[in-house]
């Protein structure tokens, strides 16, 4: 906190310029008018102030706007944004995508900070939903953004926004998140033809149910092993050997290398060994020939 002292004669700042770097902290506090600073915020970025001087400028804005900065100031914060705390940002009402972009640009190349997370949260809540333009912007700056949201938050993503999602944006999503995103993607891409549809839906298939995988197996999609390994185990288990063979096409040979990993391992345990043998891959661990398979879950449901 800088002591309140009168501004020395002749030192009152008429504009925000480089001469202010020669002011001591108390002089900045005493001689820079907060309203002037607010109207000339864009100039601060061009002046090589020290951390300590920037702290004084922030303090002046805080005093001028105790309830939170107006968007006209926020848009021009530049480097000063990194000085803001999440508590400061929670007071803001950011509605313009241009403002959001300007502030994300400041943090570009860094991990998502608590400040940025708070800013995004305020912005999305203000808009009511994660629209396509916002999602485009956020995933451009932070490819992992989508996967940082809870399933509840993802439920506010409209299907139309799914067009903005790139495969790398889903790299860190877990099955619960893909369970929410997959139906939206299915809806978004429903009017595409077979091969184009598969290219778009492929990244979301970790949320696909068994019946959709069965349908895909009829379309010569040639799913790669990396995609297959990300499928829900409970969705893969009911697939027959013939369906998996059709689903993977020439990639079926890759099952051998993955036979000890889920979901392949669990799927093998559910198949008849003689069916597995038809693949000619040497997969072992299926149900021996002549054994009867009882579905106990069905039995429990009946009793």
């Amino acid at each position: 906190e800088v002591e309140k002292t009168a501004c020395p004669s002749g030192k009152k700042a008429r504009e925000i310029d480089e001469s202010l770097i020669f002011y001591k902290k108390w002089e900045l506090e005493a001689c820079v008018d907060a309203a002037l600073l607010a109207t000339q915020m864009d100039r601060v970025n061009a002046i090589p102030f020290t951390y300590e001087q920037l702290d004084v400028l922030k303090h002046k804005l805080d005093e001028l706007y105790p309830q939170g900065y107006p968007e006209s100031v926020i848009q021009h914060l530049g480097y000063l944004f990194l000085k803001m705390s999440p508590e400061d940002i929670r007071k803001w009402n950011v509605t313009s995508l241009e403002t959001l972009k300007a502030l994300l640009e400041v943090n570009k190349g860094h991990e998502m900070s608590p400040q940025v997370a708070t800013l995004i949260d305020r912005f999305v809540k203000g808009r009511g939903q994660l629209d396509k333009d916002t999602l485009d912007t956020l995933t451009a700056f932070y490819p992992g953004y989508l996967c940082s949201l809870s399933p509840e938050e993802l439920s506010s993503v409209p299907p139309s926004s799914i067009w903005a999602v790139r495969p790398q944006d889903l790299d860190t999503c877990d099955p619960r998140q893909l369970d929410v995103l997959y139906p939206k993607a299915r809806l978004a891409f429903q009017n595409m033809n077979g091969s184009e549809y598969f290219v778009k839906i492929q990244s979301f298939l970790g949320g696909a149910p068994t019946e959709d995988l069965k349908a895909l197996s009829q379309q010569n999609v040639s799913m790669d092993l990396a995609t297959f390994m990300k499928l829900r185990t409970d969705a893969v288990l009911p697939l027959t050997v013939a369906e998996v063979q059709k689903l993977l096409g020439p990639h079926v040979e890759g099952l051998k290398a993955e036979e000890r990993h889920r979901p392949v391992r669990d799927w093998i345990l559910r198949q008849r060994q003689d069916d597995l043998d038809t693949l000619g891959l040497g997969l072992q661990g299926g149900i021996p020939n002549g054994y009867l398979v009882l579905d106990l879950s069905m039995q429990e449901a009946l009793s």
Epitope: E18, N45, A46, I47, P48, F49, T50, G78, Y79, F81
Partner: nanobody, 117 residues
């Protein structure tokens, strides 16, 4: 991406030193530079300023006529020529680079020590 200062040392009153502020990992052309100094137990103070083009310079009253700031964009370096040094010029000198309009990047150096004694 950082600024590295060099050229400090021990010098007698009335002597000269030339400090360098070199950019590592980014191009200094588009950045305005400020030189600051901090004497032991005192607040850091601004010493000199040069605009990104080099066309505008400014100095603290205490160093006017003795210090000269310049830049060589080909060498990605800004210089502070310090003449007629006084004991009160003693301190750690560091540079700050500000990116300007549409560029919020800002870089600080660790500093180089100057002792006039």
């Amino acid at each position: 991406l950082q600024l590295v200062e060099s050229g400090g040392g021990l010098v007698q009153p009335g002597g000269s030193l030339r400090l360098s502020c070199a950019a590592s990992g980014f191009t200094l052309d588009y950045y305005a530079i400020g030189w600051f100094r901090q004497a032991p137990g005192k607040e850091r103070e601004g010493v000199s300023y040069i605009s990104s083009s080099g066309g505008s310079t400014n100095y603290a009253d205490s160093v006017k006529g003795r210090f000269t700031i310049s830049r060589d964009n080909a060498k990605n370096t800004v210089y502070l020529q310090m003449n007629s040094l006084k004991p009160e010029d003693t301190g750690v000198y560091s540079c700050v680079a500000a990116g300007g309009y549409g560029n919020s990047s800002r870089y600080w150096g660790q500093g180089t020590s100057v002792t006039v004694s």
